[in-house]
Each structure stands twice: as C-alpha cells, then as structure tokens.
C-alpha cells in the first residue's frame, strides 16, 4: 500500500486533462489534482490507455508514451487515495489525440528503418496508393541525443521504394541504445497523410560484413580467422561460415554462436577478431571461404538481419582437370 488513509467514498475526478505531442512521437498527458479531494487523502492517479493497456498508479500528474501517431490514442485518468489497485478510483476522465488528418490511402506504407553498422540509419517506404506520382517526400527524425527534429537530406529511390539515410552513430558508455528513433514521412506540399514509426535502437541492426584475415591448414582442419565489423563486440554477434570445395563441389555452411581464438594455431590477442575451425577439409584442393554475421539476442532484440557476405578468401590448390 501507500499514502494515508483510504476513505471509502470515491474521489472527485481529475481536472484540466490535456494532451500534447513533443518531438515526433512523444505524446504527453497532463492534468491537475481533483477539486475538493479529501484532506486525509494522499493522492495517487490511476491511468490506462483506451484498450485497458498499461495500467499505472503513480503520484505524478503527467503521463507520456512514445507511440507512432498513425492511430487515435486515448488515456483515461482517475484519482484515488492509495496505490491499491483494488481501490475504486474516481470517475475516469478521458483525453484522446488523433493522427494528422488526410486520406489514409495517401499515407506511405511499409515505413521501416535499418541501423547499418551502428553508424547510419537507412529508412525506406512505399508511396501511398492515392497519391500523385510526382509527390516529393520528406523524412524527419528525432532521438534523445538530438536537440531538435532533423530533416533527412539524402532521399533516394530503389525500384518502387523511396528511402533516405542519415548519420546515427552509437554513443559509447551511455544508455543511447535503450532509446528509439522517431520517424515521420510526409510530402512537401502537405497533400498526404503523414506516417510515423518508432525504431528501437536494439532492433533492426545490420552489421557490416566481416573481413577474413587468415586461412590456414593444420592436419585436415581449416582454421579461419576474421575481423568483426567495427562497433561490435564478438559476444554480440553470431556467424555463418560458408566453405566451398572446388573439387568435391561441396558447399558447407556452419552456424557459429561462439568464435573464440583459443587454439594455439590462431593468432592471439588480436582485438575484435574471431576464429573458427572447419573440420575435415582436404588441404590439396581449393577451398573458398566467406563469412557473414548478425546481431544476437544477448545484446539486441533482433537477430534476423544478416550482414552481406564478406569478400571470399581461398586456400589450397586447384586440381588440373584431366
């Protein structure tokens, strides 16, 4: 429990409930305490969103949420004299905020972003169905380390998709990655309905490809050593090592979750380097290796985006065809 005595009579409703938007997707509700609340009541506020989601009991007279404003969102607020969830709060007051106006069919679709190598973000979208072909799009973005909303300058086109990329560098030793990037796409003429998205910085991360440093044979094992992409520590990555043998025309793919350089055959203490031993490889044939990496769930929410493949490296000799 919390606060003072909890009178059985219901408290009056909160007053002056209002809602506003900060940045691109930060919705903030504020209210005033109820008029004529019991003097022996230590006020707490019960609030939840329209679909009874995210119930909260707190003493603050504000509540905020980071949400893409593509749909109407409502908050209901009531007052009560304790933190007890079973206590009946006052009459709930509701305040809603609607997305910007416009024909829903004019809004862009499939708005999504990928954070490339923790250094730049690339967003893409499809034009809305009810729009002119000469629509000029603008993407705006905001995150905690920016003082104001920025406009993305590098608009490009890939087939039917439009896109824009902007610098976004991981800040070391901060809670940077616990936050999100807020995105909005609209047109310069104001004819289309704006579209919003929120990109958590722990998801949709695509590393650069790794760089193979060394291939060597020891008995019938192939030792592969590579450098991981900058900005990533090896424990945060999973790997796929592909080995193609020209003679047997075999194509082996190894899914590697841990790639430590512990064998004496590997070069030691090289920073940001990973290693893997491929068993049973014929040294007197040509073997071509390539590697790709992806983030894992130890460090990131998302583990679906593979890097592009590394450049290939070969070892062994190609047999002459007889």
């Amino acid at each position: 429990g919390g606060g003072g005595a909890a009178p059985t009579e219901t408290q009056p409703p909160v007053t002056n409930l209002s809602v506003s938007v900060e940045n691109l997707c930060t919705v903030i509700w504020t209210w005033n305490p109820p008029e004529g609340a019991s003097s022996n009541c230590s006020l707490w506020y019960f609030s939840h969103f329209g679909d009874k989601q995210d119930k909260k009991i707190a003493p603050e007279t504000r509540r905020s949420i980071e949400v893409p404003l593509n749909e109407r969102i409502c908050l209901q607020v009531g007052s009560q004299c304790s933190t007890n969830e079973s206590e009946k709060p006052s009459i709930l007051v509701e305040k809603c905020i609607s997305p910007p106006e416009g024909d829903p069919e004019s809004a862009v679709t499939e708005l999504q972003c990928i954070w490339h190598n923790l250094s730049y973000m690339k967003c893409s979208w499809l034009p809305g169905r009810n729009t002119s072909p000469d629509t000029n799009y603008t993407l705006y973005y905001w995150h905690r380390s920016l003082e104001k909303i920025h406009q993305c300058e590098n608009i490009f086109r890939e087939g039917q998709y439009f896109g824009c990329s902007f610098d976004l560098t991981k800040v070391k030793d901060s809670s940077f990655e616990q936050h999100s990037v807020q995105i909005m796409v609209k047109d310069n003429a104001g004819k289309i309905k704006p579209s919003f998205n929120i990109v958590p910085l722990t998801s949709r991360v695509k590393p650069d490809p790794p760089h193979i440093k060394n291939l060597s044979f020891h008995n019938d094992d192939l030792y592969v050593q590579w450098e991981n992409p900058q900005n990533f520590i090896s424990r945060c990555l999973f790997y796929e090592v592909e080995v193609n043998n020209s003679q047997t025309e075999t194509h082996n793919v190894f899914y590697v979750q841990e790639a430590k350089c512990e064998n004496p055959e590997f070069e030691r203490n090289v920073e940001n380097t990973s290693c893997f031993m491929v068993p049973g490889v014929l040294p007197d044939t040509l073997n071509t290796v390539r590697i790709r990496v992806k983030t894992n769930k130890l460090c990131y929410e998302d583990d679906k985006l593979w890097s592009n493949w590394s450049q290939e490296m070969s070892i062994g000799k190609k047999r002459n065809s007889t």
């Epitope: 499939e110 072909p133 087939g159």
Partner: antibody
C-alpha cells in the same frame, strides 16, 4: 533483359486447387511489387492480386479473397498464386506482371491458361 | 471502387486515320491512369503511363492526355499493326480497375 514467365496452369475440376508460379529475371526482384491479372476467354482484363516487393503488403480482388493466396520468394525471384476452391468462372489466362513506379505494369508474362471444368 | 468506362467499344478504321479512344473515371483519379495495348493472342503492353507519359519504345503516334476524370488515347496516322484491344487502367487506390476495352479493327 527484364522478363517474367508464368507456369503451372492446366485443367482442374471445380473445387480443386492449382498453384501458379511466375519466375522473374533481369531486375532487382525485391524492389518491385508483382501482380496477377486474368482474362477470361473473349473477355477483358481483371486484376486478381498484388504483393509488394518485400511481401509486407498483399491485396486481393473481392472475387478471389479467401480462396487465392499470393506469396513470393525473393531468394528465388519467384511469385506464386495458390488457387483453392476453384470455380468455373476462374477459367482464364493468368498473367503475371511486374509493377513499376506509381503502380503501373511495365512488364507482362505470356500468360498461363487455367481451365476449371468437370 | 473506381469504375472506368471506355468509348467506343469497337471501332473500324482505315490506315493513316486518326483514332481517339476516351476513358472516363467515376471519380477523380489525378493522373493515375495508364493505357495498354493487347494484340490478338498476346499479352498486354504498356503504351502510356500517368495519363500522358509515353512508355519507352512506344511509337510516337501514340499519345495520351487528360487528368481527373476524363482521359484520351490518341493514335495519329493509324498503321495496320495497331489492330488490337486497348485498355485504360486506374491505379488510384485499390482495387486496380480496367476499362472494358476498345477493339480496334483495321479496314
């Protein structure tokens, strides 16, 4: 050269199923929506279904909704149309078309004939 | 749903004549109207995109005009190889809708 080629048509009984394929080449497949359009014998063109380049947006004509399923495999540069609960009125030449720009069809296949008859 | 009405349904013309086919939309569709040609036993081919833009490789005798609800396909100096069905298509919203077609016969 940009090309699309349909396959999988044939004779099927009412209530039966058929799966059409459309193999594409000569362009970055995942950047373009693909569409199925059909033409009943001696009749005009009718839009059937569309799938966006990355496969997140899928649309159907009311006449096939709930019976047909469009899908794509971007690693194989192929789009599919799974047709279930086929009816006589589904008899048509089925064309696969690549979409371009703001939703027009710039490349069409030669079509594959689907005949629904007992 | 957008309804497209083409006229005429059928036209018989002599070579070198000028031909005009019209397409009327049931509501304004901006310039989201495209014209296709389909010769007998062939698949359709794009002629005009966005109401008035010629598609690459299309002979210059084909041109398009209009916006909103009224659109026109014009063939200047008709040639024998232009015998075909012509369709207008709206891409304004979904579903895509096709006109019923205009069949052009060369006398």
């Amino acid at each position: 050269e940009v090309q699309v080629l349909e396959s999988g048509g044939g004779l099927v009984q009412p209530g039966g199923s058929l799966r059409l394929s459309c193999a594409a080449s000569g362009f970055t497949f995942s950047n373009y929506a693909m569409t199925w359009v059909r033409q009943a014998p001696g009749k005009g063109l009718e839009w059937v279904s569309t799938i966006s380049g990355r496969g997140y947006s899928i649309y159907y004509a009311d006449s096939v909704k709930g019976r047909f399923t469009i899908s794509r495999d971007n690693s194989k540069n192929t789009v599919y149309l799974q047709m279930n609960s086929l009816r006589a009125e589904d008899t048509a030449v089925y064309y696969c078309a690549k979409e371009e720009g703001h939703w027009y069809f710039d490349v069409w296949g030669r079509g594959t004939l689907v005949t629904v008859s007992s | 749903e957008i309804v497209l009405t083409q006229s005429p349904d059928f036209q018989s013309v002599t070579p070198k004549e000028k031909v005009t086919i019209t397409c009327r939309a049931s509501q304004s569709i901006g310039s989201s109207l495209h014209w296709y040609q389909q010769k007998p036993d062939q698949s359709p081919k794009l002629l005009i995109k966005y109401a008035s833009q010629s598609f690459s490789g299309v002979p210059s005798r084909f041109s398009g005009s209009g916006s909103g609800t009224d659109f026109t396909l014009t063939i200047n100096s008709l040639e024998a190889e232009d015998a075909a069905a012509y369709y207008c298509v709206s891409s304004w919203g979904l579903p895509y809708t096709f006109g019923q077609g205009t069949k052009l016969e060369i006398k």
